[in-house]
């Protein structure tokens, strides 16, 4: 009877279960009754990072210097290529795509430390009573608008993202 | 295209002054927070003033602050950096940089060396 499922490291096809090819090398064609898979090592910059049945490698990745990468660690037949920035910038995510001097905070928050050649900005989230509507790099959370002080009330509560509106007071007949 | 292009930058003497010019196109720059940054020889990338979209807040390096000024004129899409008391560790590559400050958005520079 043919199998329905296979061991780890195998794939079923055609009612038989074939060896997935090691990291590092392509599927050719799949394993017959009498053969079996054949796989070849990926070509120069290019990968396969797991057991698989792929018919092609992945190319590896471009550290691309126009947008401040460079090389932090070269690819293999099995592993990308790792990308970073050049010395004072930073990664804008985890995969490192593409290189900033220093992040910005985004609105709700504010910066706490500006940054340096060595470190990044540090943002901070406001907290209640202040606020930021801006994304900046050197710009704190502001304290919200104290309405009394003008001799307004407060018309319309405010956020981490937004000043409080102040209004005139209602006036008793 | 993001073009930011500096001038203004030449042989200054010590204690004199100087007022780069940076002209930006190619984005809607009374958005956009804008930054000096500079490279003095050899050495990394100081940040030295930044100043909001309006021009109502502005940030300052303490190693410049009361000396330099930033300002904007939206108008003209042109933002300004007016340094007096000028002293040898000024000499470096002025750049202006916008948000988000990003690797390609950047000018060629403008080189103030300042020497007797």
């Known amino acids: 009877e043919p199998p329905t499922a296979c061991r780890e490291k195998q794939y079923l096809i055609n009612s038989q279960c074939c060896s997935l090819c090691q990291p590092g090398q392509k599927l050719v064609s799949d394993c017959t009754e009498f053969t079996e898979t054949e796989c070849l090592p990926c070509g120069e910059s290019e990968f396969l990072d797991t057991w698989n049945r792929e018919t092609h490698c992945h190319q590896h990745k471009y550290c691309d210097p126009n947008l401040g990468l460079r090389v932090q660690q070269k690819g293999t037949s099995e592993t990308d290529t790792i990308c970073t920035c050049e010395e004072g910038w930073h990664c804008t995510s985890e995969a490192c795509e593409s290189c900033v001097l220093h992040r910005s905070c985004s609105p709700g928050f504010g910066v706490k430390q500006i940054a340096t050649g060595v470190s990044d900005t540090i943002c901070e989230p406001c907290p209640v009573g202040f606020f930021s509507n801006v994304s900046s790099a050197f710009e704190k959370c502001h304290p919200w608008t104290s309405c009394e002080t003008k001799d307004l009330v407060v018309q319309q509560a405010g956020t981490n993202k937004t000043d409080v509106v102040c209004g005139p007071q209602d006036r008793l007949r | 295209e993001v073009q930011l292009l500096e001038s203004g930058g030449g042989l200054v003497q010590p204690g004199g002054s100087r007022r780069l010019s940076c002209a930006a196109s190619?984005?809607?720059?009374?958005?956009?927070e804008m930054w000096w940054v500079r490279q003095a020889p050899g050495k990394g990338l100081e940040r030295v003033s930044?100043?909001?979209?309006?021009?109502?807040?502005?940030y300052y390096a303490d190693s410049v602050k009361g000396r330099f000024t930033i300002s904007r004129d939206n108008s003209k899409n042109t933002l300004y950096l007016q340094m007096n008391s000028l002293r040898a560790e000024d000499t470096a590559v002025y750049y202006c940089?916008?948000?988000?400050?990003?690797?390609?958005?950047w000018g060629q520079g403008t080189l103030v060396t300042v020497s007797s």
């Open positions: 940089a916008k948000l988000p400050f990003t690797f390609e958005d």
């Open positions: 190619g984005f809607t720059f009374r958005d956009y």
């Open positions: 930044a100043i909001n979209p309006q021009g109502t807040r502005t």
